[in-house]
C-alpha cells in the first residue's frame, strides 16, 4: 500500500525549555500545540473560571501546580494524514497523546465520518506511564479493508468535560471499478434505436467504459463513466456488456440479453371445459409472447356443418385468464373453434382448430297455432297445435307439456298433462262446469321444457248448453288470444 504522510508541523513550546519528566530529548515538549490548531497561547483558562469550549483540537487543563503554574494545553500528536491502500489489504493507524498523571480515567474513542465507532472494531489503547505524564497510543486496525472503510478517522479524548480531537486520518481504499449502474435486459422493437447505461466508480478514478456487443467492442476508445450507448437498432437478439477500467484493472458487467419483439406464437391446447345448449366454455395455453405482453385474444367460431355458409363468428376477449365462454350458439350443433392472441407487434397465427358441440337444450319457442274446443258429448276439451320450427326445438322433441287452469267462483286449480312427441293434439276431461279453462302448451326435449304458448281460454258452460266454437291462439303477429263463441 502507498502511504502518503503529511510533514509533521513543528510544535512550538508554550514555556521556554522542557518541563520535568519529558520523554523526549529534542527539547520539544510532549504536550505541544500544532500550528494547525490556530490556538493562541494567550487563551488560557484561569483556575477560577468555569470551563468553556476549547478552540481547535486543544484543551487547556484547569488544574494548576502548587506554585499555581497552569499546565500546558493537551493535543494529539500529528500522524499520517492520508493512507492509500488496495482493497483487502490490512491497515493500522494510531493517535498518540501525552497526558499529565493528575488526570484519571482518560479514554480515547475513534470516530469515522462524524460517527463513533463502537463494537466490533480492532481498536487498542496502550498506556505508557512515566513520573509526570502518561503516553497514550490508540491504535486502529482493519485486517481486510473494503470500500466501505473509506473515510475520515479521528480520535477524541475527554478531559474535565473538554474534548480533544485529533487531526483526521483519511483512508482511501482503492480497487477495481465497482458498478453503480449496469445495463439492463430489454425487449425492443426491431430496427429501433434504444439506450443502455453503464456507470462504475473507483477509487482510483477515472473509470473508463468500453461497450461490448456480441463479443465485439462497440467503442474502440474508452468513454468516461457514466456512459450511455445508443444502439442504432437490432434485427436479432444481442448480448451487451460493459467493461470498466481504472488503474487497478478491469471489471466486466453482467451480460444482458436484448430481445427483439415479435408476433406471438399461436396458443396451444385449446380445450373444452364445459358445454351447454347455447354456450361453450373454452380454455387455452398461450403461446410464446414474442417478448411483448399479450394484449387480447380473439376466438373464432365456425359451424362445422358442411351445409352451413362457412361464416366465422369472432369474439374478442382480454388475454387473461385464458378462458372464454362463447355464447349465442345453437343447441345440438357442431363448431370448429380456434384462438389467436395479439401483442403490440401483431396477431399470432390461429391455434389448431378443435371441434366442439353444444348439448340439447329446452326448446326456445312454444308450439304454434294452439286451438281449444269443447266436445260436450264426451265432456272433453280437445286441444290442437303445430310443433315449433325444427331450428328452434333445440333438440329432439320428446313430447309436450299441457297446462290447463280451471277457474270458477273464486276457485282455481292447475293441472299438467304430458303428451308424447308424435301427436299434435290432445284431449283433456272437463274438470269443472260453469268455469273458464285456460290452456298453455310447451314443447319438451331431453334438454328441458320450453316456453309455454300464450294462454287460450274457453268457457265451459253448465250441462245442457250448446257447443261452443273452438278457441285458438292467434296467428303469429296478431293481438291477444280471444275467446270465440
Amino acid at each position: 500500500a502507498i502511504t502518503e504522510a503529511r510533514e509533521e508541523a513543528k510544535p512550538y513550546p508554550l514555556f521556554p525549555g522542557p518541563f520535568p519528566g519529558s520523554l523526549q530529548t529534542d527539547h520539544t515538549p510532549l504536550l505541544s500545540l500544532p500550528h494547525a490548531s490556530g490556538y493562541q497561547p494567550a487563551l488560557m483558562f484561569s483556575p477560577t473560571q468555569p470551563g468553556r469550549p476549547h478552540t481547535g483540537n486543544v484543551a487547556i487543563p484547569q488544574v494548576t501546580s502548587v506554585e499555581s503554574k497552569p499546565l500546558p494545553p493537551l493535543a494529539f500528536k500529528h500522524t499520517v494524514g492520508h493512507i492509500i491502500l488496495s482493497e483487502h489489504k490490512g491497515v493500522k493507524f494510531n493517535c498518540s497523546i501525552s497526558v499529565p498523571n493528575i488526570y484519571q480515567d482518560t479514554t480515547i474513542s475513534w470516530w469515522k465520518d462524524g460517527k463513533e465507532l463502537l463494537g466490533a472494531h480492532h481498536a487498542i489503547t496502550q498506556f505508557y506511564p512515566d513520573d509526570e505524564v502518561t503516553a497514550i497510543i490508540a491504535s486502529f486496525s482493519i485486517t481486510s479493508v473494503q470500500r466501505s472503510d473509506n473515510g475520515s478517522y479521528i480520535c477524541k479524548m475527554k478531559i474535565n468535560n473538554e474534548e480533544i480531537v485529533s487531526d483526521p486520518i483519511y483512508i482511501e481504499v482503492q480497487g477495481l471499478p465497482h458498478f453503480t449502474k449496469q445495463p439492463e435486459s430489454m425487449n425492443v422493437t426491431r430496427n429501433t434505436a434504444f439506450n443502455l447505461t453503464c456507470q462504475a466508480v473507483g477509487p482510483p478514478e477515472p473509470v473508463n467504459i468500453f461497450w461490448v456487443q456480441n463479443s465485439s467492442r462497440v467503442n474502440e476508445q474508452p468513454e468516461k463513466s457514466p456512459s450511455v450507448l445508443t444502439v442504432p437498432g437490432l434485427t436479432e437478439m444481442a448480448v451487451f456488456s460493459c467493461e470498466a477500467h481504472n488503474d487497478k484493472g478491469l471489471t466486466v458487467s453482467k451480460g444482458v440479453q436484448i430481445n427483439i419483439k415479435a408476433i406471438p406464437s399461436p396458443p396451444t391446447e385449446v380445450s373444452i371445459r364445459n358445454s351447454t345448449a347455447h354456450s361453450i366454455l373454452i380454455s387455452w395455453v398461450p403461446g410464446f409472447d414474442g417478448y411483448s405482453p399479450f394484449r387480447n385474444c380473439s376466438i373464432q367460431v365456425k359451424e362445422a356443418d358442411p351445409l352451413s355458409n362457412g361464416s366465422v363468428m369472432i369474439f374478442n376477449t382480454s388475454a387473461l385468464p385464458h378462458l372464454y365462454q362463447i355464447k349465442q350458439l345453437q343447441a345440438l350443433a357442431n363448431y370448429s373453434i380456434g384462438v389467436s392472441c395479439m401483442n403490440e407487434i401483431g396477431w399470432s397465427a390461429v391455434s389448431p382448430w378443435i371441434l366442439a358441440s353444444t348439448t340439447e337444450g329446452a326448446p326456445s319457442v312454444a308450439p304454434l297455432n294452439v286451438t281449444v274446443f269443447l266436445n260436450e258429448s264426451s265432456d272433453n276439451v280437445d286441444i290442437r297445435w303445430m310443433k315449433p320450427p325444427t331450428k328452434q326445438q333445440d333438440g329432439e322433441l320428446v313430447g309436450y307439456r299441457i297446462s290447463h287452469v280451471w277457474q270458477s267462483a273464486g276457485i282455481s286449480k292447475e293441472l299438467l298433462e304430458e303428451v308424447g312427441q308424435n301427436g299434435s293434439r290432445a284431449r283433456i276431461s272437463v274438470q269443472v262446469h260453469n268455469a273458464t279453462c285456460t290452456v298453455r302448451i310447451a314443447a319438451v326435449t331431453r334438454g328441458g321444457v320450453g316456453p309455454f304458448s300464450d294462454p287460450v281460454k274457453i268457457f265451459i258452460p253448465a250441462h245442457g248448453w250448446v257447443d261452443y266454437a273452438p278457441s285458438s291462439t292467434p296467428a303469429p303477429g296478431n293481438a291477444d288470444p280471444v275467446l270465440i263463441i
Epitope: 465485439s216 450507448l229 442504432p232 444481442a238
Partner: antibody, heavy 118, light 106 residues
Framework: QIQLVQSGSELKKPGASVKVSCKAS????????MNWVRQAPGQGLKWMGW????????TYADDFKGRFVFSLDTSVSTAYLQISSLKAEDTAVYFC???????????WGQGTLVTVSS | EIVLTQSPDFQSVTPKEKVTITCRAS?????MHWYQQKPDQSPKPWIK???NLASGVPSRFSGSGSGTDFTLTINSLEAEDAATYYC?????????FGQGTKLEIK
C-alpha cells in the same frame, strides 16, 4: 464544426518515405480513434488500420504491417501516416477518418494523393 | 476476414427508377454501413448500422438486411445519386469494405 484536413499531394521516388498528416478540429481529439483508408487509382476502399488517440496505440490490418506507421501529436490534434520504402503500388489516395461507435466513419479527410514514380 | 461482395458492380439507370444494391457477407455480421463517393471526393457517410440514414441523406434512400444479406435501396433515382456506393461491415476485425457499386444515370 468537425473537420479533418489532410496535407497536400506528394510525389515520391521508389524507396523514399512520406509522412501524411491529418489535422482534426471541432471536437476533442482524444475522444475518437483515427482510421486510415487507402484507395488505389480506380479501385475501392481498403482499411489500413487505426490509432487510439487516447493511448497512442496503433493497430494495423495485415496488409499494412511493416512499412506503415501511425503516430500522433495530440498537442496539435494531428494524426500522421508514414510510409517507408515506397513502392509503385503504394500510389493511392490516403484518407483519414474518425472512428465512432460500431466503426462508423462519420468524418473523413479530403484525401492525400501519394504518387510513387521513378 | 469477412469478404463483402456487392452486386452489381455497375448499373446504368434512368431517373425515377427504383435501384437496389446488395452486399453479401461471407459470414454473418452485426451491422452494415454504407458510404457514397463521387469522383475526386472523399467518401460520405450514407447509411449507418444497416438502416439509419446519415444526416442530410434524402429519404428516398433506405437500408435493410441482417446476417449476411444487406441492401441499399433508392426508391426513385435522381441525377445527383450518380456515384459509387460502398458497404462496410462491423462485427468482425479487420474492418472490410465491399468492392463498390457504380451507379450511372442514363
Amino acid at each position: 464544426q468537425i473537420q479533418l484536413v489532410q496535407s497536400g499531394s506528394e510525389l515520391k521516388k521508389p524507396g523514399a518515405s512520406v509522412k501524411v498528416s491529418c489535422k482534426a478540429s471541432g471536437y476533442t481529439f482524444t475522444n475518437y480513434g483515427m482510421n486510415w483508408v487507402r484507395q488505389a487509382p480506380g479501385q475501392g476502399l481498403k482499411w489500413m488500420g487505426w490509432i487510439n488517440t487516447y493511448t497512442g496505440e496503433p493497430t494495423y490490418a495485415d496488409d499494412f504491417k511493416g512499412r506503415f506507421v501511425f503516430s500522433l501529436d495530440t498537442s496539435v490534434s494531428t494524426a500522421y501516416l508514414q510510409i517507408s520504402s515506397l513502392k509503385a503500388e503504394d500510389t493511392a489516395v490516403y484518407f483519414c477518418a474518425t472512428y465512432g461507435h460500431y466503426a462508423w466513419f462519420a468524418y473523413w479527410g479530403q484525401g492525400t494523393l501519394v504518387t510513387v514514380s521513378s | 476476414e469477412i469478404v463483402l461482395t456487392q452486386s452489381p458492380d455497375f448499373q446504368s439507370v434512368t431517373p425515377k427508377e427504383k435501384v437496389t444494391i446488395t452486399c453479401r457477407a461471407s459470414s454473418s455480421v452485426s451491422y452494415m454501413h454504407w458510404y457514397q463517393q463521387k469522383p475526386d471526393q472523399s467518401p460520405k457517410p450514407w447509411i449507418k448500422a444497416t438502416s439509419n440514414l446519415a444526416s442530410g441523406v434524402p429519404s428516398r434512400f433506405s437500408g435493410s438486411g441482417s446476417g449476411t444479406d444487406f441492401t441499399l435501396t433508392i426508391n426513385s433515382l435522381e441525377a445527383e445519386d450518380a456515384a459509387t456506393y460502398y458497404c462496410q461491415q462491423w462485427g468482425t476485425k479487420p474492418l472490410t469494405f465491399g468492392q463498390g457499386t457504380k451507379l450511372e444515370i442514363k
